[in-house]
Interface confidence: medium
C-alpha cells in the first residue's frame, strides 16, 4: 500500500522512540567515525521533520524516498571529505546508486579504539544523570563497529542494557550484579552481530537465491509440522526483512519484522507448537524468541522421501515444471526429517540432487539414471560427521585454550598471509565451537558445530576482502556459500609461502603483561603463537609446543620477580635465544 | 562383505509379543534406512515399517500402528521391531532390508536384504 510520506508512515508504525533509535542505528552504520554529538543532532533534524510529515504528509519533501531524506542528511555533514575519504565522492550521486556506494563503504574493521569498561560507579552515575544520551551512546557504539549489526535486534539489547542498569545501580553489590550481565551482552552482542554478517554476504554475495534456499532449510528444521506453502511464506517475508535490514533500509526492516512475528504468532497452529510462550512477550523479546525458538516435534509418519524424489517416474517432469519449487520441497522435506544435520550440509545435499537432475534428465534412461542418487550423499554426510568427531575428540583432550592453538597452528600453515590480528581473533572463535557444541549429543552437533564455523568463516571472509592478501582464502570465500567449510578444511600447508623473517620486537614482552586479564594473556601469546608459524611453517607440533611451554613459564616467572621489567629483558633475551635454537630461525 | 541377519522370531501366542533384530555387518547403519517386510504363504510381500538412517523419521503399516515400534542402535549397528497384540493373521517370514539414508516406498528400491525370521503366531 502505498504511503504519500514513507518518512511519515514509518514514524506513525513505529512510534518516536524506535524511529529515533533506529535512525541513530542507520546513521552510526553508514558513518562510523562521525563523533556521537554530530549522529545526535542530525538524528534529531530528520526526527523534526518527520513530525512536520505525521501532522501533514503533503508537506515539503515529505514525498521523498527515506534513502533520499537520510542521504541528504549524511552528505551535509561537513567533514565528510577529510574524515571518509573516497565515501565522499557518493554524495556526488544520485539515488539508488548514492546509497549503495555508502553501503559499499561500510567497514567491517573500523580504526577505532577499543570499548573500555568504565569503573561501574561511573557507569550508574551517568546512567542515572541522563539515562536517554547513556543508552544512545550504545546504540551508537555498538552500531558503528557493528555495520551490519540486525537493527531491530539492537533494540532489543538496548532494551535488555537499560534493564540491567535500572536493577543493579540500585543493588547493594553494583558491580557483582552489573558486570556479569554486561559480559553476556557482549559476548551474545558479538555473536549476534556475526551471525547477522553471514545473512548480509549471503545475500549481497551469492544472491537471495542462496538466503531463501538457507531460510527454507533452517525453518524446514524449526517448523517440521508446517506445510511448504506456510514455509514458503514466511521465508519470502524473512528474505525482504533481511534484504531491507543488510541494505540499510532499517526502519522498514523493523517494521516488516514486527509485522511477521504478528503473522506468526497469529498463525502459530500452523507452524509451530514451540511458540506459545514466544507470543505472549512484547514485541522486541518476541521476536527475538520466536528467531531462537527450539526445533518443534517432527510429524509422525512421514512419508517416504524417495517416493516423490527418487522412485516416482515424474521426477523429472515436475523438475522442468517449476525447478526451484521442486527444489525448495526437496529441501523442505529433506530438512524436515533431519535437524541432526547442519543447514549447509542440507544445501549441500540438494545441490548434489539438484546436479543429478540436470545431468540425468537429460539422459536416454532418466530414471535409471537417478535412482541411487541417495548413495552420492554418503561421503557429504560423513565428512561433516568424522570431522566434528575428531575435532570434539582433540577439544576433549586438550580444553579451549591449547584446542584454540592447534586451530591457530592449523590456520596459519594454511593461509599464513593474512594478518595475524584476523587469524588470531578467527582461531579463538573456530576454537570456541568446542564448548558450545561438543557438550551436545550426536544429534545435535552438526548442526551447532558446521553452522557456527560457517559464521566464525565468514568473519574470516569480510576482513580478507578489506585488504585481500591470499588467493586461496578469495577461492575459499567465494567459490561456494556452502563449501567454505570443506574448502578451508581441505587446506593443507601453503608450500609458496616464504617465511617471514624473524624480528626479535615481535618477540619482546613487558611487565604490562602481568596486569592484563587471562583473556588478554591469552591473545598476546597466541600472537607470539602465530608469528612464530609465520617465520617457522614446517616447525613440528612438538618444536611449537615446547617453545610455547617455555614462554608461559617465562611470563609466569617474570611476573612473580620484584624488578619485572628487568626480568622480562634479560629472561626475554634468553627465551628468544633458545627459541631461535630449537627452531633454527 | 556386507550381511543383514534377523533374529528373534519364532512361536508365538495371539495377543503375545516379540522382539525382532536386524544386525548388519560389513558395513555400518548410520547411512541407512532400514525396513521390515513380512510375507505369509501365499502372499505378496508386505512393507511393516521403516526408520531413516537419522531415527527421526518413522513409518508404520496403518495395520500396525499403535502396536508395533521400530527403533534403532547405531553403537550396535541394530535395528529393532517391538511388535505387541501379535494376530495370527500375522504369521510370516519378516525380512530387513536397507537402503541409503531415506525409507523407500518400493521394495525393489532397498539395496540388502537379510534372509528372514520366521514368526508364527498360533495358540
Known amino acids: 500500500d502505498a504511503h504519500k510520506s514513507e518518512v511519515a508512515h514509518r514514524f506513525k508504525d513505529l512510534g518516536e522512540e524506535n524511529f529515533k533509535a533506529l535512525v541513530l542505528i542507520a546513521f552510526a552504520q553508514y558513518l562510523q567515525q562521525c563523533p556521537f554529538e554530530d549522529h545526535v543532532k542530525l538524528v534529531n533534524e530528520v526526527t523534526e521533520f518527520a513530525k512536520t510529515c505525521v501532522a501533514d504528509e503533503s508537506a515539503e519533501n515529505c514525498d521523498k524516498s527515506l534513502h533520499t531524506l537520510f542521504g541528504d542528511k549524511l552528505c551535509t555533514v561537513a567533514t565528510l571529505r577529510e574524515t571518509y575519504g573516497e565515501m565522499a565522492d557518493c554524495c556526488a550521486k544520485q539515488e539508488p546508486e548514492r546509497n549503495e556506494c555508502f553501503l559499499q563503504h561500510k567497514d567491517d574493521n573500523p580504526n577505532l579504539p577499543r570499548l573500555v569498561r568504565p569503573e561501574v560507579d561511573v557507569m550508574c552515575t551517568a546512567f542515572h544523570d541522563n539515562e536517554e544520551t547513556f543508552l544512545k551512546k550504545y546504540l551508537y557504539e555498538i552500531a558503528r563497529r557493528h555495520p551490519y549489526f540486525y537493527a531491530p535486534e539492537l533494540l532489543f539489547f538496548a532494551k535488555r542494557y537499560k534493564a540491567a542498569f535500572t536493577e543493579c545501580c540500585q543493588a547493594a553489590d553494583k558491580a557483582a550484579c552489573l558486570l556479569p550481565k554486561l559480559d553476556e551482552l557482549r559476548d551474545e552482542g558479538k555473536a549476534s552481530s556475526a551471525k547477522q554478517r553471514l545473512k548480509c554476504a549471503s545475500l549481497q554475495k551469492f544472491g537471495e537465491r542462496a538466503f531463501k534456499a538457507w531460510a527454507v532449510a533452517r525453518l524446514s528444521q524449526r517448523f517440521p509440522k508446517a506445510e511448504f506453502a506456510e514455509v514458503s511464506k514466511l521465508v519470502t517475508d524473512l528474505t525482504k526483512v533481511h534484504t531491507e535490514c543488510c541494505h540499510g533500509d532499517l526502519l522498514e526492516c523493523a517494521d516488516d519484522r514486527a509485522d511477521l512475528a504478528k503473522y506468526i504468532c497469529e498463525n502459530q497452529d500452523s507452524i509451530s507448537s514451540k511458540l506459545k510462550e514466544c507470543c505472549e512477550k512484547p514485541l522486541l523479546e518476541k521476536s527475538h524468541c520466536i528467531a531462537e525458538v527450539e526445533n518443534d516435534e517432527m510429524p509422525a509418519d512421514l512419508p517416504s522421501l524417495a517416493a516423490d524424489f527418487v522412485e516416482s517416474k515424474d521426477v523429472c517432469k515436475n523438475y522442468a515444471e517449476a525447478k526451484d519449487v521442486f527444489l525448495g520441497m526437496f529441501l523442505y522435506e529433506y530438512a524436515r526429517r533431519h535437524p541432526d544435520y547442519s543447514v549447509v550440509l542440507l544445501l549441500r545435499l540438494a545441490k548434489t540432487y539438484e546436479t543429478t537432475l540436470e545431468k540425468c534428465c537429460a539422459a536416454a534412461d532418466p530414471h535409471e539414471c537417478y535412482a541411487k542418487v541417495f548413495d552420492e550423499f554418503k561421503p557429504l554426510v560423513e565428512e561433516p560427521q568424522n570431522l566434528i568427531k575428531q575435532n570434539c575428540e582433540l577439544f576433549e583432550q586438550l580444553g579451549e585454550y591449547k584446542f584454540q592453538n592447534a586451530l591457530l597452528v592449523r590456520y596459519t600453515k594454511k593461509v599464513p598471509q593474512v594478518s595475524t590480528p584476523t587469524l588470531v581473533e578467527v582461531s579463538r572463535n573456530l576454537g570456541k565451537v568446542g564448548s558450545k557444541c561438543c557438550k551436545h549429543p550426536e544429534a545435535k552437533r552438526m548442526p551447532c558445530a558446521e553452522d557456527y564455523l560457517s559464521v566464525v568463516l565468514n568473519q574470516l571472509c569480510v576482513l580478507h576482502e578489506k585488504t585481500p592478501v591470499s588467493d586461496r582464502v578469495t577461492k575459499c570465500c567465494t567459490e561456494s556459500l556452502v563449501n567454505r567449510r570443506p574448502c578451508f578444511s581441505a587446506l593443507e600447508v601453503d608450500e609458496t609461502y616464504v617465511p617471514k623473517e624473524f624480528n626479535a620486537e615481535t618477540f619482546t614482552f613487558h611487565a604490562d603483561i602481568c596486569t592484563l586479564s587471562e583473556k588478554e594473556r591469552q591473545i598476546k601469546k597466541q600472537t607470539a603463537l602465530v608469528e612464530l608459524v609465520k617465520h617457522k611453517p614446517k616447525a613440528t607440533k612438538e618444536q611449537l609446543k615446547a617453545v610455547m611451554d617455555d614462554f608461559a613459564a617465562f611470563v609466569e616467572k617474570c611476573c612473580k620477580a620484584d624488578d619485572k621489567e628487568t626480568c622480562f629483558a634479560e629472561e626475554g633475551k634468553k627465551l628468544v635465544a633458545a627459541s631461535q635454537a630449537a627452531l633454527g630461525l | 562383505q556386507v550381511q543383514l541377519q534377523e533374529s528373534g522370531g519364532g512361536l508365538v501366542q495371539p495377543g503375545g509379543s516379540l522382539r525382532l533384530s536386524c544386525a548388519a555387518s560389513?558395513?555400518?547403519?548410520?547411512?541407512?534406512?532400514i525396513a521390515w517386510f513380512r510375507q505369509a504363504p501365499g502372499k505378496d510381500l508386505e512393507g511393516v515399517s521403516c526408520i531413516a538412517s537419522s531415527g527421526g523419521a518413522t513409518n508404520y503399516a496403518d495395520s500396525v500402528k499403535g502396536r508395533f515400534t521400530i527403533s534403532r542402535d547405531n553403537a550396535k549397528n541394530t535395528v529393532y521391531l517391538q511388535m505387541n497384540k501379535l494376530k495370527p493373521e500375522e504369521t510370516a517370514v519378516y525380512y530387513c532390508a536397507a537402503a541409503t539414508f531415506e525409507c523407500r516406498g518400493r521394495s525393489s528400491s532397498y539395496d540388502y536384504w537379510g534372509q528372514g525370521t520366521q514368526v508364527t503366531v498360533s495358540s
Open positions: 560389513g558395513f555400518t547403519l548410520d547411512y541407512y534406512a
